[in-house]
């Protein structure tokens, strides 16, 4: 997910239009019907490392 | 101290239109989602529409979804709800009302209200 | 949608009494739940949010608690001020919030 600016969101949060910021993704199990939880679904988990640079 | 002040209420025709105004301040209102919220004479709450901080992002009650549409001019530290083809039904005194700092789970402030009455 | 329903829809207390009002949720709703206060006339007042977190300014007496569907509001000792309208508040499907029909708390 994409912040305004093409700004990424760092690992583990997703962009909030509802809130215009960056969400811990942390709380979408505990309520999945925030709109930035949909970014985390698709963005890799927080302790997800590239293998390359 | 942190203020809201609705405005723009009256009596309106059924199928007509009024615009309402919630003027802010004591805060910095750009960070801040903000919300309509209704009240039926001598009934419960009822929220009627979410904007986001930027504007950017908005829902609706479906009672009102397609009629009613809510805005935010930020330079001006001011919430508006554009309301047509108002119905009986809609008469209330209608709240804005501040989210809270971290998400909008909450609504810490409110204004005064403004009454609505639709009627022929 | 989720629905809020509070009990008892109205009760009469005296000062100095315990009160206690619950909202029940339709379905789970963790701990997103907020408690407001309305006054005849007046706005909504926050009194307590996320369950059980006392808003700035609100009397110790308020106290709230509760996770899942039910939820409760106590007022350890009711004050002549605190004769009003209590509303729970759901916040768990936010920006699409819900509130219980209300408990008006009057003189005994």
């Known amino acids: 997910e994409q912040a305004p600016g093409n700004a990424p969101c760092s690992s583990g949060s997703s962009w909030s239009a509802d809130l215009d910021k960056c969400m811990d993704c942390a709380s979408c199990p505990a309520r999945p019907h925030s709109d930035f939880c949909l970014g985390c679904a698709a963005a890799p988990p927080a302790h997800f490392r590239m293998l390359w640079p | 101290e942190v203020q809201l002040l609705e405005s723009g209420g009256g009596l309106v025709q059924p199928g007509g239109s009024l615009r309402l105004s919630c003027a802010a301040s004591?805060?910095?209102?750009?960070?801040?989602?903000m919300i309509w919220v209704r009240q039926a004479p001598g009934k419960g709450l009822e929220w009627v529409s979410y904007?986001?901080?930027?504007?950017?992002?908005?829902h609706y009650a479906d009672s009102v979804k397609g009629r009613f549409t809510i805005s935010r001019d930020n330079s001006k530290n001011t919430l508006y709800l554009q309301m047509n083809s108002l119905r009986a039904e809609d008469t209330a005194v209608y709240y804005c009302a501040r989210g809270g700092d971290t998400y909008f789970d909450y609504f810490d402030y409110w204004g005064q209200g403004t009454l609505v009455t639709v009627s022929s | 949608d989720i629905q809020m329903t509070q009990s008892p829809s109205s009760l009469s207390a005296s000062v100095g009494d315990r009160v206690t009002i619950t909202c029940r949720a339709s379905q789970s709703i963790s701990g997103y739940l907020n408690w407001y206060q309305q006054k005849p006339g007046k706005a909504p007042k926050l009194l307590i949010y996320q369950a059980s977190s006392l808003q700035s300014g609100v009397p110790s007496r308020f106290s709230g608690s509760g996770s899942g569907t039910d939820f409760t509001l106590t007022i350890s000792s009711l004050q002549p001020e605190d004769f009003a309208t209590y509303y729970c508040q759901q916040s768990y499907t936010s920006p699409f919030i819900t509130f219980g029909q209300g408990t008006k708390v009057e003189i005994k």
């Open positions: 004591g805060f910095t209102f750009s960070p801040y989602p």
């Open positions: 904007i986001s901080p930027s504007g950017g992002s908005t």
